[in-house]
């Protein structure tokens, strides 16, 4: 609450999280021209990466291009891609939405299309649908463990959202545990309001706002943190300003001296922790 | 501007970055002792590293050190890094300047000079210059979206820089469009009075600021981001202090058995997003 | 200062790294079931990672499990784990402490011990101690550059910590150098009152806070920055609620085309930037 | 460019000795053996740094091949004992700068073992 009389400060924060938590997939493998079921398993190693700061990211969806080499190909036959002759195709051309250079030659994609040439890592990537149900989507069970020290130099004080009584084995609730900083990613969603099944499919942000109130004076000293979520990308976003939360990224190798690699667009979750908050003294 | 009845708020705020693009570069490749021109293409996945928060990266330039292995091996022939006797190389001394640790014994590196051996990744990196004109120039004509999520939460205000009746295939101007938050990054730079295909060799910083001025009042409401671009890393620095932006990074491997990898010094333009601004209200 | 009749604002701040320094790693190395001390040299690309934004980190210890696979094996014994009959073992069960998903059976870890079988990156991780001492604890003399960029737009003042004048090869001290922005990681922990050599073997996150107090009337004009140190995780947190700083990260790879991966548990510092302070003008 | 004499090679029965040597035009760091069998990629063989620091050999030869240098000569030697019919191939000598990596490389002499 405002106390007029009070110095406020702004709050200096760092923050720390741990993701726990194991995921069970089961997708279609071909190999050798035969589609099986194959069933993996993903720890945190293999669907968060190592990132600093006040943002955590959890996979939970991706789509695999495999064995993609650098050469000539026919572009992905998307819609208004399709060509009838080499005059629909422009040497040199870097159309946006494409993955290559255009050769300036129209040739068959499949038994029934045509497209443009393009010099690229092929074959291409498909633009097909992000898998339906998510494919981690058990990563709604995955907890995060969040560490916040904050520091008002004005006032010199500082303190963490951790404290010595605190029980390493909690969950964050909202009425029966609200200053426990081990969170469940489905009820982070939830108390958002969000689906976090239907997130999972195309990814989002969702954002973990800390807040510290702080009274600093001794007489009624109070300075633990408010924690509270919301989601941060619009969920009613037009395609062509790239709705969810993806990104790419590959695993280069060789493969009988071929320089390869394996294109994995990621979809997930990223989590923004939002620090704010002021120390007031009189 | 300011209204000294309202009661001001610093704004809270969320970033999400998307950057397109594909890049032809043409370079040297020497292969089994012949050197010739090598064309390859690089997509997103090449050129940008899955990053979190306010900044993005763009590589525009690079120099591999290929196939380096644990080993002992001359160090590169630096400036005043020569030697003549094993005198001159101190067993367990590491030069900040270079690459390993000596031996104690000064060896040949070529015909006419001499270095202290090392134990290093050999061979060690050569300090050449960065290529110019810089490898991914045609970087210039990459485009980045921006999504920016705002809050003010003592007001218990949320916005967003992109409305539903944004166009997805706008381009950033500062006269016909300065609304659209799709940026080419050559029209950053040059907003910014700087030479894309120049800072494209060493690399740097651009910082996009993204001020937020917001009168929450209903009666005279606006609360629409102004965008601003200024270079952020200082072009007349001195080079002990690493003018440019650049980073290392390595790809392992294994080869007959024995642990390899390739060096990248990548070179390229990291984007900061700076958001900032308050919301008024009575 | 506190001037009243000025209009305070608060510093937007961007900031780069660069780490310098190179470290002999001695480890056992066990291959074809004979074991033999190791040396190997790790410089930057080996340490710290390609990192945005106000933070950085670096390597000082780690843990390796190689050669995993994807396949079915006994969990790891730690406290609690073991079972006698598989009736302790509960099918499609995950354990958050445990690295994979229950099949139902107990079976032989070893000769006088029995666990649950799990599906898992297989053998599942040993959850031994983090070496000691660390096997970086030489990174205690890698230094960082810190290039800082500050502007109070409101007051259109731009400034850096790093001016013209300044000498490449200094070192931060204190009282004989408080302007140089080149910190020996070791003084950094000196300067918080913490002890490296300690800290390197289970990581934590140290603050290095730059506070600018800038005065921007012309007739007495100030703007410099002021480094101070402090760590900010808590040394003496519960085992539960995970002391130090560690992530796990793994290298994928194919052997006789069988999907592989080595998992580091990588543990270090994290040193967190944290830039505030205010410019006041009339 | 470096230029590389190979000297010594021959026939031999298995279990025989042979003695290979290298000239170099110039000084070079790390001096090697590589070797090709008819049919098959060039493969490393053995290779010395500066004054026979450090050494370094193929799993297939170790304990039957010791090479050595004489730096103020730019020659390396590879002494070649318990040969077997598949050590036949053309052995060339190479140069480079480190014992991983080579560069230059000779014409070659040819290793005939017979059984």
């Known amino acids: 609450s405002d106390k007029l009389y009070q110095r406020k400060e702004p709050v200096i924060s760092s923050v720390h999280t741990k993701v726990k938590g194991i995921a069970e997939v089961t997708e279609n493998v071909t190999e050798g021209g035969v589609t099986k079921l194959g069933h993996s398993i993903f720890d945190t190693a293999d669907y968060t990466f190592p990132l600093q700061g006040n943002s955590f990211f959890v996979m939970t969806n991706y789509v695999k291009s495999e064995g993609q080499v650098q050469t000539l190909c026919p572009e992905y036959p998307r819609r208004g891609a399709q060509c009838s002759s080499d005059r629909r195709c422009k040497k040199g051309w870097m159309d946006p939405q494409s993955k290559g250079i255009q050769t300036g030659r129209c040739v068959p994609y499949d038994k029934t299309r045509k497209t443009c040439e393009v010099s690229a890592w092929c074959p291409t990537e498909e633009e097909k649908e992000a898998p339906r149900p998510a494919l981690l989507r058990s990563a709604e069970n995955f907890t995060v463990l969040i560490k916040n020290n904050i520091h008002f130099p004005g006032h010199n004080y500082t303190t963490r959202n951790i404290l010595p009584t605190m029980n390493g084995s909690c969950t964050f609730h909202k009425t029966w545990d609200p200053q426990c900083s081990i969170f469940r990613l489905g009820d982070i969603f939830q108390e958002a309001g969000e689906n976090f099944t239907e997130v999972a499919v195309q990814g989002g942000i969702m954002g973990i706002e800390i807040y510290w109130d702080c009274n600093l004076d001794s007489w009624s000293h109070h300075c633990r943190p408010r924690y509270s979520f919301r989601r941060l990308d619009d969920k009613n976003m037009d395609e062509s300003f790239v709705p969810g939360y993806n990104f790419r990224y590959a695993k280069y190798y060789k493969e009988n001296n071929v320089e390869k690699r394996t294109l994995i667009k990621a979809f997930g979750i990223r989590f923004d922790i939002l620090v704010f908050g002021t120390g007031g003294k009189f | 501007s300011d209204k000294l009845y309202q009661r001001k708020e610093p704004v809270i705020s969320s970033v999400h970055t998307k950057v397109k693009g594909i890049a032809e570069v043409t370079e040297n490749v020497t292969e089994g002792g012949v050197t010739k021109l090598g064309h390859s293409i690089f997509d997103t996945a090449d050129y940008t590293f899955p990053l979190q928060g306010n900044s993005f990266f763009v590589m525009t330039n690079y120099v591999k050190s290929e196939g380096q292995v644990q080993t002992l091996c001359p160090e590169y022939p630096r400036r005043g890094a020569q030697c003549s006797s094993d005198r001159r190389c101190k067993k367990g001394w590491m030069d900040p300047q270079s690459k390993g640790i000596q031996t104690g014994r000064c060896v040949p590196y070529d015909k006419t000079r001499k270095t202290c051996e090392v134990s290093a990744w050999c061979p060690t990196e050569e300090e050449k210059e960065a290529p110019r004109p810089a490898l991914l120039r045609s970087a210039e004509n990459f485009t980045v979206l921006i999504k920016n999520n705002i809050h003010f939460p003592g007001h218990n205000y949320t916005t967003r820089n992109i409305l539903p009746t944004m166009n997805g295939s706008c381009t950033f101007h500062k006269t016909w469009d300065p609304q659209c938050s799709i940026f080419r990054l050559g029209d950053i730079f040059q907003e910014a009075g700087e030479n894309f295909t120049e800072v494209a060799v060493q690399g740097g910083i651009m910082g996009i600021e993204i001020y937020w001025d917001c009168n929450l009042d209903s009666w005279s409401h606006h609360c629409r981001p102004r965008y601003s671009f200024r270079r952020l890393d200082d072009k007349n620095m001195d080079e002990s202090f690493v003018p440019g932006y650049n980073f290392r990074y390595a790809k392992y491997y294994k080869e007959n058995n024995v642990e390899k990898r390739t060096l990248i010094k990548a070179f390229g333009i990291r984007f900061d997003i700076l958001v900032f601004g308050t919301g008024g209200k009575f | 200062s506190d001037k009243l009749y000025q209009r305070k604002e608060p510093v937007i701040s961007s900031v780069h790294t660069k780490v310098k320094g190179i470290a002999e790693v001695t480890e056992n190395v066990t291959e074809g079931g004979v074991t033999k001390l190791g040396h190997s040299i790790f410089d930057t690309a080996d340490y710290t990672f390609p990192l945005q934004g106000n933070s950085f980190f670096v390597m000082t210890n780690y843990v390796k499990s190689e050669g995993q696979v994807q396949t079915l094996c006994p969990e790891y014994p730690r406290r609690g784990a073991q079972c006698s009959s598989d009736r302790r073992c509960k099918k499609g069960w995950m354990d958050p402490q445990s690295k994979g998903i229950q099949t139902g059976r107990c079976v032989p870890y070893d000769k006088t011990r029995k666990t649950c079988e799990v599906s898992a990156w297989c053998p599942t991780e040993e959850e031994k101690e983090a070496p000691r001492p660390a096997l970086l604890r030489s990174a205690e003399n890698f230094t960082v550059l810190i290039k800082n960029n500050i502007h109070f737009p409101g007051h259109n003042y731009t400034t850096r910590n790093i001016l013209p004048t300044m000498n490449g090869s200094c070192t931060f001290h204190k009282t004989w150098d408080p302007q140089c922005s080149i910190f020996r990681l070791g003084d950094i922990f000196q300067e918080a009152g913490e002890n490296f050599t300690e800290v390197a073997v289970q990581g934590g996150i140290m603050g290095i806070e730059i506070y600018w107090d800038c005065n921007l009337d012309s007739w007495s004009h100030h703007c410099r920055p002021r480094y101070s140190f402090r760590r900010l995780d808590d040394k003496n947190m519960d085992e539960s609620f995970v002391p130090g700083y560690n992530f796990r990260y793994a290298k994928y790879y194919k052997e006789n085309n069988v999907e592989k991966r080595t998992l580091i548990k990588a543990f270090g510092i994290r040193f967190d930037i944290l830039v505030f302070g205010t410019g006041g003008k009339f | 460019e470096v230029q590389l004499v190979e000297s010594g090679g021959g026939l031999v029965q298995a279990g025989g000795s042979l003695r290979l040597s290298c000239a170099a035009s110039?000084?070079?760091?790390?001096m090697g053996w590589f070797r090709q069998a008819p049919g098959k990629e060039r493969e490393f063989v053995a290779g010395?740094?500066?004054?026979?620091?450090?050494?370094r050999y193929a799993d297939s030869v170790k304990g039957r091949l010791t090479i050595s240098r004489d730096n103020a000569k730019n020659t390396v030697s590879l002494q070649m004992s318990g040969l077997k019919p598949e050590d036949t191939a053309i052995y060339y000598c190479a140069t480079g700068t480190s014992v991983y990596h080579y560069q230059y490389w000779g014409q070659g002499t040819q290793v005939t073992v017979s059984s």
């Open positions: 110039e000084r070079t760091y790390s």
């Open positions: 010395s740094g500066w004054d026979g620091i450090p050494t």
